[in-house]
Interface confidence: low
């Protein structure tokens, strides 16, 4: 992996802005065609801005214009946009124009959200992206291919970065059990710029809590943890960035029973009573001297399955009482 990165870095240093990528066949054809089609003043170049910003839900225009050495080229051409990385990234848009045609017929528009605004015959490959989502925040690369009597192609190497901004949205808020019979709360929010998260609740004031860095591959997600919920009541997570704020709450209710010692005594008493009952049943059956095997179940009797995980937790740990919660 490190070697690959080093190799890419070397390539990035060696190749000029906008890379002239040709096959051997293309190269020989170009040596023949350059004299006919090229003017010394013109060469391949691509003009793209370093970044375009737009809000999630809106549309954005990715500008891309180019110059080429093949004056009056009127043959078939293909316009392509890729995402992620040049040359190898997945295509998100592709259109083809027939010889002499100004109409670039769309062959690929990922999810129907990409539309060519520019006219490739007029050296303009500008693209409109509809209904932006945070996942569209990446780098895009324009490319043009000539495929008639001239075989040539050119692709922007640096590309244009589409920066998608979004008001915060809390995607998950939950209460989880933690060691030492306690509960912890987790709040995950998305937004760009990544939102600042704050917890507020009983005896908390306004706590920034432990904020985890955005997860790899999910750069717009931020998680804040409240390690120990010590009081019952409503805990509110607030996510805020320059575009807005969002709130969601969870409620913690613990059913406070008797003291620890009396709880243990009650449990032991209940277990002892059950043991006595079992012995009684066994004794009664033995007294009947029935030849059949004992009809005891393979697994001990269980109480009916609870709907709430927190109720199950409370069964497993009597001193860790149940909690209730709600999602955003």
């Amino acid at each position: 992996m490190e070697k690959s990165i080093w190799l890419l870095a070397c390539l990035a240093w060696v190749l000029p802005t906008g890379s002239f990528v040709r096959t051997k066949i293309d190269t020989t054809e170009n040596l023949l065609n350059t004299e006919v089609h090229s003017s010394p003043a013109q060469r391949w170049s691509m003009q793209v801005p370093p970044e375009v910003s737009a809000e999630a839900g809106d549309a954005a225009v990715l500008p891309c214009t180019f110059t080429h050495p093949h004056r009056h080229y009127d043959g078939p051409l293909t316009a392509i946009w890729r995402a992620g990385e040049p040359y190898a990234g997945p295509q998100v848009f592709r259109c083809a124009a027939a010889r002499g045609s100004e109409l670039c017929q769309t062959a690929l528009s990922l999810h129907g959200r990409f539309r060519l605004l520019g006219n490739p015959r007029r050296n303009d490959l500008s693209l409109r992206v509809e209904r932006l989502a945070l996942a569209d925040d990446r780098r895009y690369f324009c490319r043009v291919e000539f495929a008639g009597d001239v075989h040539d192609r050119y692709e922007s190497r640096h590309g244009v970065r589409l920066h998608v901004t979004a008001a915060p949205r809390i995607v998950n808020i939950s209460v989880l059990p933690s060691p030492a019979h306690a509960f912890r709360a987790l709040c995950t929010a998305e937004g760009e710029p990544p939102p600042a998260l704050a917890w507020s609740g009983p005896a908390l004031g306004n706590s920034l809590a432990a904020v985890r860095s955005p997860r790899e591959g999910h750069g717009h997600l931020v998680t804040a943890e409240l390690p120990a919920l010590t009081h019952d009541g409503r805990y509110t997570c607030t996510a805020a960035n320059s575009l807005g704020r969002s709130e969601a709450s969870v409620y913690l209710f613990r059913f406070h029973g008797a003291s620890g010692a009396s709880t243990v005594a009650l449990l032991l008493g209940a277990l002892g009573f059950k043991a006595l009952l079992l012995l009684g049943v066994l004794a009664a059956r033995a007294a009947r001297r029935r030849p059949e095997h004992l009809d005891t179940p393979d697994t001990p009797p269980r109480s009916q399955a609870q709907e709430s995980n927190y109720e199950n937790l409370s069964q497993m740990n009597p001193r860790s009482p149940p909690a209730t919660m709600c999602s955003p």
Epitope: G57, H111, G112, R131, A133, A167
Partner: antibody, heavy 121, light 104 residues
Framework: DVQLQESGPGLVKFSQSLSLTCSVT?????????WNWIRQFPGNKLEWMGY???????NYNPSLKNRISITRDTSKNQFFLKLNSVITEDTATYYC??????????????WGTGTTVTVSS | QIVLTQSPAIMSASLGEEITLICSAS?????MHWYQQKSGTSPKLLIY???NLASGVPSRFSGSGSGTFYSLTISSVEAEDAADYYC???????FGGGTQLEIK
């Protein structure tokens, strides 16, 4: 409470144009959201046709691109569907629908009651 | 274009029964939405973003899934749940073919 109501002729002749109006009450179509047309064919299959955004820009289903146009009249808080060169397969119930976008995804949260259009030959 | 396939096309369920409707996508998607359409009415948003209940939807409905496989579950079917159910994928505006739920 936002409400959408479709109106227009229930019968359109083959090869003519279908024109429908969606009247929106309770929300200004210039304030936000995407304002869509969706149709449901007799076999119950649903097809998204296109939308007009709050800023007036459009997007259409590629399969209808050459025949469809969605416009609006902001003063009346209405948006319109025009489908040219109709064929019998365009017989359907047409719904105008509001689409909400929440930063990650979009979904249709308010639907009109629908209007049935039959294409006669 | 992403194709959404719903199964089964028709499902018959008894009152109180738990049922699951399936929606599979031809390629991976981030979210799925579900709509309910009762006879003679327009579709109604039931579940959005895979698992969130729309306003006024009873808690017996739930949704889950990821990637290419999504499901809608009704924990205890009631008579009023008889309807057609459609899954919907946002980024390419496609709908599934629907599942018709009949109550025995």
């Amino acid at each position: 409470d936002v409400q959408l109501q479709e109106s227009g002729p229930g019968l359109v002749k083959f090869s003519q144009s279908l024109s429908l109006t969606c009247s929106v009450t309770g929300y200004s179509i210039t304030s936000g959201y995407y304002w869509n047309w969706i149709r449901q064919f007799p076999g119950n299959k649903l097809e998204w046709m296109g939308y007009i955004r709050h800023d007036g820009s459009n997007n259409y289903n590629p399969s209808l691109k050459n025949r469809i146009s969605i416009t609006r009249d902001t003063s009346k808080n209405q948006f319109f569907l025009k489908l040219n060169s109709v064929i019998t397969e365009d017989t359907a119930t047409y719904y105008c629908v509001r689409e909400i976008y929440d930063g990650s995804s979009g979904y249709f949260d308010v639907w009109g009651t629908g209007t049935t259009v039959t294409v006669s030959s | 274009q992403i194709v959404l396939t719903q199964s089964p096309a028709i499902m018959s369920a008894s009152l109180g029964e738990e049922i699951t409707l399936i929606c599979s996508a031809s390629s991976s998607v981030s979210y799925m939405h579900w709509y309910q359409q009762k006879s003679g009415t327009s579709p109604k948003l039931l579940i959005y973003r895979t698992s969130n209940l729309a306003s006024g939807v009873p808690s017996r409905f739930s949704g889950s899934g990821s990637g290419t496989f999504y499901s809608l579950t009704i924990s205890s079917v009631e008579a009023e749940d008889a309807a057609d159910y459609y899954c919907h994928q946002w980024s390419s505006w496609t709908f599934g073919g629907g599942t018709q739920l009949e109550i025995k």
